[in-house]
């Protein structure tokens, strides 16, 4: 797995450089987490044919996966520090369980997986830190996750292919925007 | 292979709006990280950003012309419009679309087209 | 705005001299940096991306350095064809802004 932002060798390296600041910290972390992404795409891409499949949106009904509409305040039209914050902080939550449906689902990158769930973790503290208005963060329900995580994996094989690849993209689209909205903050 | 071909008006009279046209192949806005700018260039000056546009239709305009500038895309032509409006003669310049794409959305311009002249 | 600010505006060189061109941001862009040359009635060509990335089909003779707000693009052995306008770029904030330039020229 690669090595957590903060501890690169460029950072040993310049001992006297300025701390990064709240904004660099996340900004650093989602890019940290996108590498981690693009690794485990690899080996989902390269296991299957799922990438190229035109087959995503019967797989994608079933799944209800976090995504930045304009209503959110993420955009350029009515972009909305506060509102923002609060998609991209909930969203993240959401992803939680399809991130936890991501363990055990890749055999040479599986330190990987592990590292992008922890990473998430770690980038919703940041984020949290940042926030003024937690009370409108809603947590996802315990109970409502646990049998999504169940009727996931209790899915045929092309499915669990399918839902993996489908998780990948959506979590990358989404971190993307993040990183878009949160440069304006 | 990625390409990108400008087209639109070679003349434009003063206080008219300008429609320039980017369409472009090799890539589409369905994969995110994807977006595709405007940048003019009046004669022997430098290059000056004007308008970007992403894979999910977010978009950004220079500061200095917002009012003036309006960019849309049509996903199943495969084609980027910029509109500029209330033209003046220092509006003269060569005027590029370009594409960024990368993880990071870095805004590194990997493709250009050829470029209009306008006048 | 992010002010890029270029040096020198031009430079004269023979083939085969080390050059370096400068760019400096008006404020902290961490890695968000990239260069373009223009030829002589061409379109920019992306050379450097984030600062020291290379770009497939650029020639290794191009290089760049730099963090936070000074940068630079080396070039180790000028060829006659890297006769141009270099231009760097700031990708961290909009709008997006590019430096004056520096062209290059052969004495």
């Known amino acids: 797995a690669p090595v957590p932002p903060g501890e690169d060798s460029k950072d040993v390296a310049a001992p006297h450089r300025q701390p990064l600041t709240s904004s660099e910290r996340i900004d650093k972390q989602i890019r940290y987490i996108l590498d981690g992404i693009s690794a485990l795409r690899k080996e989902t891409c390269n296991k299957s044919n799922m990438c190229e499949s035109s087959k995503e949106a019967l797989a994608e009904n079933n799944l209800n996966l976090p995504k930045m509409a304009e209503k959110d305040g993420c955009f350029q039209s009515g972009f909305n520090e506060e509102t923002c914050l609060v998609k991209i902080i909930t969203g993240l939550l959401e992803f939680e369980v399809y991130l936890e449906y991501l363990q055990n689902r890749f055999e040479s990158s599986e330190e990987q997986a592990r590292a992008v769930q922890m990473s998430t973790k770690v980038l919703i503290q940041f984020l949290q830190k940042k926030a003024k208005n937690l009370d409108a963060i809603t947590t996802p329900d315990p109970t409502t996750n646990a049998s999504l995580l169940t009727k996931l994996q209790a899915q045929n094989q092309w499915l669990q292919d399918m839902t993996t690849h489908l998780i990948l993209r959506s979590f990358k689209e989404f971190l993307q925007s993040s990183l878009r909205a949160l440069r304006q903050m | 292979q990625v390409t990108l071909k400008e087209s639109g008006p070679t003349l434009v009279k003063p206080t008219q709006t300008l429609t320039l046209t980017c369409i472009f192949s090799?890539?589409?806005?369905?994969?995110?990280?994807?977006?595709v700018g405007w940048i003019r260039q009046p004669p022997g000056k430098a290059l000056e950003w004007l308008a970007l546009?992403?894979?999910?239709?977010?978009?950004r305009y220079s500061p200095s012309l917002k009012n003036r500038l309006t960019i849309t895309r049509d996903t199943s032509k495969n084609q980027v419009v910029l509109t500029m409006t209330n033209m003046d003669p220092v509006d003269t310049a060569t005027y590029y679309c370009a594409r960024s794409y990368d993880d990071y959305l870095y805004y590194a311009l990997d493709y250009w087209g050829q470029g209009t002249l306008v006048t | 705005d992010i002010v890029m600010t270029q040096s020198p505006a031009t430079l004269s060189v023979t083939p085969g001299d080390r050059v370096s061109l400068s760019c400096r941001a008006s404020q902290s862009i961490s890695d968000y940096l990239h260069w373009y040359q223009q030829k002589s009635h061409e379109s920019p060509r992306l050379l450097i991306k984030s600062v020291s990335q290379s770009i497939s089909g650029i020639p290794s003779r191009f290089s760049g350095s730099g963090s936070g707000s000074d940068f630079t693009l080396s070039i180790n052995s000028v060829e006659p064809e890297d006769v141009g306008v270099y231009y760097c770029q700031n990708g961290h904030s909009f709008p997006l802004t590019f430096g004056a330039g520096t062209k290059l020229e052969l004495k």
């Open positions: 546009i992403y894979w999910d239709d977010d978009k």
């Open positions: 090799g890539f589409s806005f369905k994969t995110s990280g994807v977006s």
